[in-house]
């Protein structure tokens, strides 16, 4: 009877013990097993859950414009006064709805190279108004002419095919023509077939981004999504030294298992450069843990302040010597056209650049870019990409539109924010197929062995005391 | 097919005037702007005169300020050059030229004036 | 005003040689210099203009090159008919000026 009783209280103390290292053992080998999972789940081919999405994002995304209505053209053009400007806004486009094209797989390099199709549909009720809502803008061919041309004798022809449209140094347009393009009345007059069209996204619908290539992350995940080249050059032509690299991916999404001390670092075709995203804060969103990643202000710091980007510096004289900062000219991408890019408001710019305009109000939260990417499987599961396109405009003695300018001006066109949220299905569905399987392997593990132990230790004293007991 | 034909050449005596033009065929002269080049015997080209597109800007070289006047006329696709004061040195073959970006593409067959007494 | 000088003022050459005919502004005129060819009691013809853009029509053997100051117009293999006297010209400011000109014989 005394023997049943110890052989049942041992019987339990080794089935405990035999759960608790079960449950130990599920911990390296479950991770084993998520580890593998996730890395066949996360190569870009046919039959994954990353090639579904990364074909055809299932976000949808928008792309929110604030327009700078300038509120004193003529006193700016006359007096050379400060622009003051007002925001108008939003004006919401759907963008990225459309599949990517072209897709070719190389088994050979382990890429996979495609192009992304661009679109873009009005969306009237997340607008404040319609897309025939006129504003005062600068006028861009205006702006743009002695800028390309900086040669005397042409200046002085463009001046009287300016003077002979009725141009002038600002102009009224509606939000379509100023986006997606209109004909210019001044460049209709250039006696030679070039583009009349101008806008400033312009060509923009029925036009396609890339050739990207890709690594498919088949040989090694650890650079899956990872831009082996674009239109086929590993370099963009645009800027010296190490600044012309492509590095990273296009943000969609990054190698697995992202830590927080990793800077993620992609590729902007809209900004013509690469750029990166630090460990800001861990959030949760729609109940999956994330990783909130932001552009630092150390991305848009002048040489001085961060020598890594003395090559982002093309230019001095606007520059002041290349001590401004947080504006950044991307002519040499644009055609020579005298194109900035900056954060909206001038957020993290230095004060000469914003201090000829009235009306700004940078503000963190609203301007700044983020990326929200989940980081097991190294999704961007959300994000809010914020930019601001500019235009220089300069003093031009032989242009009357722009011979009282006194001093040079970074004028605020438009400032856009384009945001993508992992929808409610998809949310819950990542979180059945992702965190929950780990959540619940977790769970798991921590039962058996949590079980295992208190099995053991209870089974163990109950066993010690009944001995103890039979002693006596 | 472009073309420019000059005429009004002539001899002329010192202090006389002459007026030259340039008549155009396949582009309209307002679009582009026409200049006058002129080369005396035995020497160099010498820009002379400009009338920017539309009319919108006459330019002359120092030679001739004062005494050579450039004109168009729209309906009529002409260019003229209004000499006037004219002096030995202004002896040569004058050519129409068209131009936009400021090298000259299409020219005339040129016309002769001559100064002399 | 800018100068516009040329050199040589004349040369020799046979059929088949390769010719470089040099022209140096008197100031920056970045790439605005264009190069004519013209023949006895003829109208100039324009060659290249952008310091080196061969205008239509003109044979690949014309090329021209530089920036800034100094300027080059080379014809790689010299044919019968390109015996003429070749000028240069800038195009960047007003009053335009031309090179004092080349003449190129035949040796």
């Known amino acids: 009877m005394g023997c049943d009783r110890n052989c049942g209280l041992i019987a339990g103390a080794v089935i405990g013990a035999v759960l608790a290292v079960f449950g130990g053992i599920l911990m390296p080998v479950g991770d084993m097993l998520i580890e593998k999972t996730i890395k066949r789940e996360v190569v870009l081919e046919e039959g994954t859950t990353a090639f579904k999405n990364w074909v055809k994002t299932g976000t949808t995304v928008y792309r929110q414009f604030w327009i700078f209505d300038v509120q004193n053209p003529d006193d700016v053009a006359k007096n050379s006064s400060k622009i003051k400007v007002k925001q108008r806004g939003p004006y919401t486009y759907r963008v990225r709805y459309l599949a990517k094209e072209n897709i070719t797989q190389d088994p050979e390099d382990h890429t996979v190279s495609f192009v992304q199709p661009n679109g873009a549909i009005f969306e009237p009720s997340l607008s404040v108004g319609t897309e025939d809502d006129n504003f005062t803008v600068l006028n861009l061919a205006v702006a743009a002419a002695p800028h390309i041309y900086q040669n005397s004798f042409v200046q002085v022809v463009l001046n009287s095919l300016i003077k002979k449209s009725k141009s002038s140094m600002f102009q009224t347009r509606s939000l379509k023509e100023l986006l997606w393009g209109y004909k210019d009345p001044f460049l209709s007059l250039v006696p030679y077939p070039i583009s009349t069209t101008v806008g400033v996204f312009y060509p923009y619908n029925d036009t396609v981004d890339g050739v990207y290539k890709v690594f498919n992350g088949k040989d090694n995940i650890s650079k899956v999504a990872i831009i082996e080249s674009y239109k086929g050059k590993r370099n963009l032509s645009y800027w010296p030294s190490y600044c012309d690299m492509i590095n990273g991916t296009d943000a969609a999404s990054f190698p697995p298992f992202v830590e927080k001390s990793r800077t993620l670092r992609f590729f902007s075709s809209d900004i013509c450069r690469s750029i990166y995203a630090v460990f800001g804060s861990e959030i949760d969103l729609k109940g999956i843990p994330v990783y909130r990643f932001v552009l630092p202000a150390n991305a848009f710091a002048s040489p001085l302040q961060n020598p890594d980007n003395h090559c982002f510096c093309t230019e001095k004289v606007i520059s002041n010597n290349c001590t401004s900062y947080g504006v950044l000219d991307i002519g040499k991408c644009k055609e020579g056209k005298p194109v900035y890019i900056s954060l909206p408001h001038f957020l993290h710019a230095s004060p000469d650049v914003s201090e000829p305009i009235e009306g700004l109000h940078p503000n963190e939260d609203e301007h700044r870019t983020y990326l929200d990417v989940e980081p097991i499987t190294g999704f961007t599961l959300q994000f809010a990409k914020r930019l601001q396109v500019n235009i220089l405009v300069k003093p031009a003695r032989k242009i009357e539109a722009l011979k009282n300018l006194k001093r040079p001006y970074i004028v605020p066109i438009l400032w856009l924010n384009e945001t993508g949220t992992i929808g409610d299905e998809k949310a819950e569905m990542f979180k059945t197929q992702v965190t929950g399987k780990i959540k619940l392997l977790g769970m798991v593990e921590m039962a058996l062995l949590g079980i295992g132990v208190v099995m053991f230790v209870a089974f163990m004293i109950s066993y010690c005391a009944c001995k103890s007991k039979n002693g006596k | 097919e472009v073309q420019l034909v000059e005429s009004g050449g002539g001899l002329v005596q010192p202090g006389g005037s002459l007026r030259l033009s340039c008549a155009a065929s396949g582009f309209t002269i307002s679009s582009f702007g026409i200049h006058w080049v002129r080369q005396a015997p035995g020497k160099g080209l010498e820009w002379v005169a400009w009338?920017?597109?539309?009319?919108?800007?006459?330019y002359y070289a120092d030679s001739v300020k004062g005494r050579f006047t450039i004109s168009a006329d729209t309906s009529k696709n002409t260019a003229y050059l209004q000499m006037n004061s004219l002096r030995a040195e202004d002896t040569a073959v004058y050519y129409c030229?068209?131009?936009?970006?400021?090298?000259?593409?299409?020219w005339g067959q040129g016309t002769l004036v001559t100064v002399s007494s | 005003d800018i100068q516009m000088t040329q050199s040589p003022s004349s040369l020799s050459a046979s059929v088949g040689d390769r010719v470089t005919i040099t022209c140096r502004a008197s100031q920056d005129v970045s790439n605005w210099v264009a190069w004519y060819q013209q023949k006895p009691g003829k109208a100039p013809k324009l060659l290249i203009s952008?310091?080196?853009s061969l205008y239509s029509g003109v044979p690949s053997r014309f090329s021209g090159s530089g920036s800034g100051t100094d300027f080059t117009l080379t014809i790689s293999s010299l044919q019968p008919e390109d015996f003429a006297t070749y000028y240069c010209?800038?195009?960047?400011?007003?009053?335009?000026?031309f090179g004092q000109g080349t003449k190129v014989e035949i040796k």
């Open positions: 952008y310091a080196t």
């Open positions: 010209q800038q195009h960047s400011n007003a009053p335009l000026t």
């Open positions: 009338i920017a597109p539309y009319g919108g800007y006459t």
């Open positions: 030229a068209r131009s936009f970006f400021g090298y000259f593409d299409y």
